[in-house]
């Protein structure tokens, strides 16, 4: 413990105390504040200034202050969080959500509750990526595009364009080519087979899938349909 090295003084009538000083109502004097990392151990009197002391472990003060006790640091970060700022005598611990998660319930500093980012399912791609404070939004893959993954980052990708279509693509599956040179690179003479994927996803009942190849249809679940003509709001 040490005293701050100057004596309290009475302010001029109608005047204010200087920077890093406060007016003590009991002593009716301008007294020193304690610096960040310390707190007021003994308040000032008419003849002695504030006595400051260091914050104890797991407590802190971030500002110049005259609080009798330092503030407690927040509890340890939960398993879905990472500590981005440690608890020191001058700053509180800050917990932020770990990668793949976002803050569903924030607090003054850091996050109170993290939630896992939504993953878009086959047939849907990311329309709006997740941020520190907002979840992923998914959208149906438009005709001519697909997504065959469950992912919080994958967008809908164009179907490969085939010279000869073996199986037309749909919202959750790429087109399958029999030609030797589809528009996306692959080994000469190979038949491109998309990754196997469950066709179950948020789709309408099976109807002919949209295809880049004219005159072909293939019964598989496909993306949702726009409203009937005449609906408002477009």
């Amino acid at each position: 413990p040490r005293a701050v090295a100057f004596t309290p003084y009475a302010p001029e009538p109608g005047g204010t105390c200087r920077l890093r000083e406060y007016y003590d109502q009991t002593a009716q004097m301008c007294c020193s504040k304690c610096p960040p990392g310390q707190h007021a151990k003994v308040f000032c009197t008419k003849t002695s200034d504030t006595v400051c002391d260091s914050c104890e472990d797991s407590t802190y003060t971030q500002l110049w202050n005259w609080v009798p006790e330092c503030l407690s640091c927040g509890s340890r970060c939960s398993s879905d969080q990472v500590e981005t700022q440690a608890c020191t005598r001058e700053q509180n611990r800050i917990c932020t959500c770990r990668p793949g998660w976002y803050c569903a319930l924030s607090k003054q500093e850091g996050c109170r509750l993290c939630a896992q980012l939504r993953k878009c399912r086959p047939g849907f791609g990311v329309a709006r990526p997740g941020t520190e404070t907002s979840d992923v939004v998914c959208k149906p893959c438009a005709p001519g595009t697909f997504s065959n993954t469950t992912s919080s980052t994958d967008i809908c990708r164009p179907h490969q364009i085939c010279h000869v279509v073996a199986i037309p693509g749909n919202a959750s599956m790429d087109a399958v080519c029999t030609s030797t040179s589809p528009t996306r690179s692959m080994a000469p003479g190979a038949v491109h087979l998309p990754q196997p994927v469950s066709t179950r996803s948020q789709h309408t009942q099976p109807t002919p899938a949209p295809s880049t190849a004219p005159g072909t249809s293939f019964l598989l679940p496909v993306g949702p349909s726009p409203p009937a003509e005449g609906s408002t709001g477009d």
Epitope: A115, Q116, R118, K119, C120, R121, G123, F124, A127, R128, D135, V136, V137, C138, K139, P140, T150, R200, S201, Q202, H203, T204, Q205, P221, G223, P224, S225, P226, P227, A228, S231, G233, D234
Partner: antibody, heavy 125, light 107 residues
Framework: QVQLQQSGPGLVKPSQTLSLTCAIS??????????WNWIRQSPSRGLEWLGR?????????DYALSVKSRITINPETSKNQFSLQLNSVTPEDTAVYYC???????????????WGQGTLVTVSS | DIQMTQSPSSLSASVGDRVTITCQAS??????LNWYQQKPGKAPKLLIY???NLEIGVPSRFSGSGSGTDFTFTISSLQPEDIATYYC?????????FGQGTRLEIK
């Protein structure tokens, strides 16, 4: 806080059209992250999803196959509401009808998080 | 359509009891399952999403588990305000479907 306020008649004659409206406050019918659903509940069928409308750069509709030939769900952006029309009703369509907001269409974490107060619709002559 | 079968259809338990409801899907629905609570004259209320995630503000005595086709909903210590009907709901595929409900009463 999202709130859904339902309106519409409680009595409809057989073969006529059931029409209900759900007014949205605290969110937008054109929201790029929500979907707007109609669900009904009756003692015989329990909770039955009827369909939804949602906007992702364009409007989408999905309908239950059981009512697909008779149902229309339309967004009304100017009034921030959406409507249900069910044609050619029969007494079997008697139920409490709910509108509900769905968060997470097409992804994991897809659920109904806000519901209207429910409207009992009786189909009877 | 994917059928969701809940059991039991009704049950009676005492305050403080551990209560378990099961929900079986007619085909694999992965983890795409939610649980709702409905009190008389009210709309359903989301309790748990994606099998086991508690909605914000829902008491921790509610929990869920399972995957594939078999799922369980548990109230660890029944409270008087838990008297309601509970529904499971799948969103693996359209149409979205609900279980027939489990009515919970106090003994």
């Amino acid at each position: 806080q999202v709130q859904l306020q339902q309106s519409g008649p409680g009595l409809v004659k057989p073969s006529q059209t059931l029409s209900l409206t759900c007014a949205i406050s605290g969110d937008s019918v054109s929201s790029n992250s929500a979907a707007w659903n109609w669900i009904r509940q009756s003692p015989s069928r329990g909770l039955e999803w009827l369909g939804r409308t949602y906007y992702r750069s364009k409007w989408y509709n999905d309908y239950a196959l059981s009512v697909k030939s008779r149902i229309t769900i339309n967004p009304e952006t100017s009034k921030n509401q959406f409507s249900l029309q069910l044609n050619s009703v029969t007494p079997e369509d008697t139920a409490v009808y709910y509108c509900a907001r769905e968060d997470g269409v097409g992804g994991t974490k897809d659920y109904f998080d806000y519901w209207g107060q429910g409207t009992l619709v009786t189909v009877s002559s | 359509d994917i059928q969701m079968t809940q059991s039991p259809s009704s049950l009676s338990a005492s305050v403080g009891d551990r209560v378990t409801i099961t929900c079986q899907a007619s085909q694999d629905i992965d983890n795409y399952l939610n649980w709702y609570q409905q009190k008389p004259g009210k709309a359903p209320k989301l309790l748990i999403y994606d099998v086991s995630n508690l909605e914000i503000g829902v008491p921790s005595r509610f929990s869920g588990s399972g995957s594939g086709t078999d799922f369980t909903f548990t109230i660890s210590s029944l409270q008087p305000e838990d008297i309601a009907t509970y529904y499971c709901q799948q969103y693996d595929n359209l149409p979205l479907t609900f279980g027939q409900g489990t009515r919970l009463e106090i003994k």
